[in-house]
Amino acid sequence: SITGISPITESLASLSTYNDQSITFALEDESYEIYVEDLKKDKKKDKVLLSYYESQHPSSESGDGVDGKMLMVTLSPTKDFWLQANNKEHSVELHKCEKPLPDQAFFVLHNRSFNCVSFECKTDPGVFIGVKDNHLALIKVDYSENLGSENILFKLSEILEHHHHHH
């Protein structure tokens, strides 16, 4: 369960892949599309509001009873829209929604590689946001493999702005 309904902290950041491609969001036909692309030098990076929440581990997963805590995150590139996992389609989509947000909007944050992050679906453990064919997709990761897989690693570059409502 998520501890409390308020985030413990929020930050505004740009999101890029391990290979320094930018994650961008475009309004097309009244819905948002998500792209992974090389940005032209003069183009401003898109901002994402990351809201961080604490969540208790189910004790069976962590082996540490009530002690285990996870850091969960929601990602909002524009007001009232959040990234969501579509597990049936193995896709990552932007949906307009009201709070309380659905579980599909929550991702467990992993610092898998030093100074990089990964986003694991709350609703589908072992499935991560990843890059596939210049789009974001859901990628199943075998825990027996080395989880440093570059296609699920992202870089966060904080944008030092103090207001949290953006666009």
Epitope: G68, L71, V108
Partner: antibody
């Protein structure tokens, strides 16, 4: 209850080796970021090495790169620090510590061992 | 590497006093900052994480604030058991660096 118990410290000559152990109980070691932090007696804290939870990726501070190796034995729930080519400036109390959050180091370190003293002297 | 500058390096205070310790990061670290208390011969003890979250079991007289580059640890009314050395640590990016420490001594 979470517990971390270090062992393996002692007196060693410059150029020698030591292997520190950190026995963990009350949680699953591979689910958490773990770190070794050292403290020269009477001085401040310095992060030496760390290992990522599930991925097992490793980090070393510049002064120990190529000399120290962090590892873990998941079956024994134990963290290790192999220290080779030891120098006088490595003399310190070495602590192992576990993060607040499984999978992330953003919350800092909630659980610490009692520390083990490493003295490098001829 | 991110440098953490802590001040003051030491402070002499009386029981019941309000104590404020500051920590400044050489670059923005969002809210990714932890505060620790350490007593002689003991391991550090986590007091505050994510800049302002009070660790379970830590008395409410301890509080943390700040974001970006400037952070503060406040002890609202110092108790005898609070005489110790306090360290900040940035937990934003590796290497995770500590401040130089603030020794809180009895006046």
């Amino acid at each position: 209850e979470v517990q971390l118990v270090e062992s393996g410290g002692g007196l060693v000559q410059p150029g020698g080796s030591l292997r520190l152990s950190c026995a963990a109980s009350g949680f699953t070691l591979r689910s958490y970021f773990m770190t070794w932090v050292r403290q020269v007696p009477g001085k401040g804290l310095e992060g030496v090495s760390a290992i990522s939870g599930i991925s097992g990726g490793t980090y070393y501070t510049d002064s120990v790169k190529g000399r120290f190796t962090i590892s873990r034995d998941n079956s024994k729930n134990t963290l290790f620090l192999q220290m080779n080519s030891l120098r006088a400036e490595d003399t310190a109390v070495y602590f192992c510590a576990r993060t607040v959050y499984s999978s992330s180091y953003y919350g800092g370190f909630q659980h610490w061992g009692q520390g083990t003293l490493v003295t490098v002297s001829s | 590497d991110i440098q953490m500058t802590q001040s003051p390096s030491s402070v002499s205070v009386s029981v019941g006093d309000r104590v404020t310790i500051t920590c400044r990061a050489s670059q923005g670290i969002s809210s990714w900052l932890a505060w620790y208390q350490q007593k002689p011969g003991k391991a550090p003890k986590l007091l505050i994480y994510v800049a302002s979250s009070l660790q379970s079991g830590v008395p409410s007289r301890f509080s943390g604030s700040g974001s970006g580059t400037d952070f503060t640890l406040t002890i609202s009314s110092l108790q005898p058991e609070d005489f110790a050395t306090y360290y900040c640590q940035q937990t934003n990016s590796f290497p995770l660096t500590f401040g130089g420490g603030t020794k809180v001594e009895i006046k």
